[in-house]
């Protein structure tokens, strides 16, 4: 049975086996096509989601689709139902929390009162002044809190208490990539992790431990990637894995927050990387223990210089490392989070690519998560 399952797939009506390598090859090998059913699927970027959250205290902004202008949500008459609608528009199913925060002196958007129409937030037509003088600060999910704060050093062994959102993504029980828990159903990782194996069936997620082999595996229901862009082959290195059963959160299993849409990190901003990847370039072996390291944002202009990536780092990517080199993500860390701490931890990047590991002029290149928020929200909404 084990050998059959490993090398063959059972087609129904009529019952017969096909080689497992024929799964997800684009050809219908089973009469009913079930060999192409449970495969990595691509999902288009989709329409603009008409709500977003700003790094200014997680304040809610709403799009006026007629003009294309964004407005800040006034706290006047804002209700729990409106908060739920806003979060549902972003694909969240959990119970949100919201509060009033004072309109700041730097408020550059017009402030409008919010109403609801066909399960979408709208601006109230006859919106007068914002009498409360407050904006809506909205949190769709409790995220980005860990039991332990890491110390700022070079590279050291990590504890799952510090990084309860880190998962190991495994194919046939072998660690392939890292990933981050975003909510009970969803894990964020890199699309290139699935290039070799596009059948969902053999992929598993392991959460809740800093040791590679020591925790139970979770079944995967769907793997979704963004449509590939043949003009920029290294862009769009992002994937979402939907778990078959929702996670139960605990001290060692928790979600990390998505970044705010306007999360622009300046060069030298401190960030963290974690993973079970190779400890040396071409080092031949994964680390059994989760490792963590502090790095910093490296300016894209510097990263695109002639002695570095020569323009290959696009607007949808970011670079991180340390100027002198030596601290970097490596093979096996792919898909894991590049993290920034403000009030909570945010996954600002996904370990994507780079030339070598730890070179001074070629730091790690990461998928910029804020560039894909719209896509993430559209995937989640489609799966609600």
């Amino acid at each position: 049975k084990v050998i059959l399952d490993k090398y063959y797939f059972l087609c129904g009506q009529p019952l017969h086996f096909i080689p497992r390598k024929q799964l997800c090859d684009g050809e219908l090998d089973c009469p009913l096509g079930e060999d192409e059913e449970h495969c990595v699927k691509s999902f288009p970027e989709g329409p603009a989601v008409a709500v977003r959250l700003s790094k200014d205290r997680s304040t809610l902004q709403v799009l006026d689709s007629a003009t294309g202008n964004w407005f800040s949500a006034c706290f006047d008459n804002f209700t729990e139902a409106l908060a739920e609608t806003a979060c549902r528009q972003m694909g969240y199913s959990s119970k949100p929390t919201f509060r009033a925060v004072e309109i700041g002196p730097d408020q550059d958007l017009d402030v409008v009162e919010i109403t609801e129409n066909s399960q979408e937030l709208r601006m109230r037509n006859s919106s007068g002044p914002c009498l409360s003088g407050s904006l809506v600060s909205l949190h769709c999910l409790a995220c980005g809190k860990s039991l332990k704060t890491p110390r700022v050093v070079g590279v050291e062994e990590a504890s799952v208490d510090s990084w309860p959102w880190q998962v190991s993504i495994q194919y046939d029980k072998q660690h392939v990539c890292g990933g981050s828990i975003l909510d009970p159903h969803w894990v964020l990782t890199a699309a290139h992790c699935f290039r070799k194996h596009t059948d969902v069936f053999n992929w598993k997620v392991r959460a809740g431990s800093d040791k590679l082999g020591s925790f139970p595996s979770l079944a995967v229901a769907k793997i979704i990637i963004i449509e590939f862009n043949p003009m920029y082959p290294k862009d769009n290195d992002i994937a979402l894995m939907k778990l078959q059963f929702p996670l139960t959160f605990s001290g060692t299993v928790r979600p990390i927050c998505l970044p705010f849409f306007d999360e622009e990190l300046t060069p030298a901003t401190p960030l963290w990387i974690i993973g079970w990847g190779f400890t040396k370039q071409n080092g031949g072996k994964m680390s059994d223990i989760l490792l963590q390291a502090s790095v910093q944002v490296i300016d894209s202009t510097r990263c695109n210089a002639d002695d570095a990536y020569q323009g290959e780092v696009t607007e949808k990517m970011m670079c991180a490392g340390i100027p002198e080199g030596g601290v970097d993500t490596c093979q096996g860390d792919s898909g894991g989070p590049l993290m920034y701490q403000s009030d909570q931890w945010h996954v600002v990047g996904i370990v994507s690519w780079g030339y070598g590991c730890g070179g001074p002029s070629t730091p790690g290149v990461y998928t910029k998560v804020s560039a894909y928020l719209n896509w993430i929200y559209n995937v989640w909404k489609a799966e609600l």
Epitope: A48, N229, P230, M231, Y232, E312, T314, E315
Partner: antibody
Amino acid sequence: EVQLLESGGGLVKPGGSLRLSCAASGFTFSSSWMHWVRQAPGKGLEWVSAIGTAGDTYYPGSVKGRFTISRDDSKNTLYLQMNSLKTEDTAVYYCARVRLGHFDLWGRGTLVTVSS
Amino acid sequence: DIQMTQSPSSLSASVGDRVTITCRASQSISRYLNWYQQKPGKAPKLLIYAASSLQSGVPSRFSGSGSGTDFTLTISSLQPEDFATYYCQQSYSNPPTFGQGTKLEIK
């Protein structure tokens, strides 16, 4: 000299097949993403297909299932196999190299005429 | 697919004129926009990539600007060799798409 040179165009009947070639020289072909772009007489440019360095292929809906792009890195040559040709496939076919999101190198083109 | 719309479709100008061609995308494409020049019977030639970066060897009288949905190609002082058809192209998402072209003719 860095260049691309297409060949294989000609007159073919609707439903027929044709294979275009594109010979590359003066650059590292094996590490380049290559595309085909076409231009119907007196009309604009239309992307036709792309092939990655690992041989992965991409097509728009208009040609998917009829056209096949391939490459032979040992010969520095790009191919486009066109089957079930329609009159609307009549165009000049260009091969082009992509770098950082733009077509930075183009061939001179080869004319394909589909007519009965 | 993202639609690219150029305006005008054609325009007449004289040597020495300043000319602007615009390109509008059906959705935001950030700065993922390129401009090409094509002369009759020839292959297109890259002028500007990433909205405003001048391709090596292209005269500095050509410049590009814009981001999001609206972009412009400007020729500061038309030269006789600039009379041609100009195309914009987005590389933001699959499939890559081109504008319908702007034919620049001698007045």
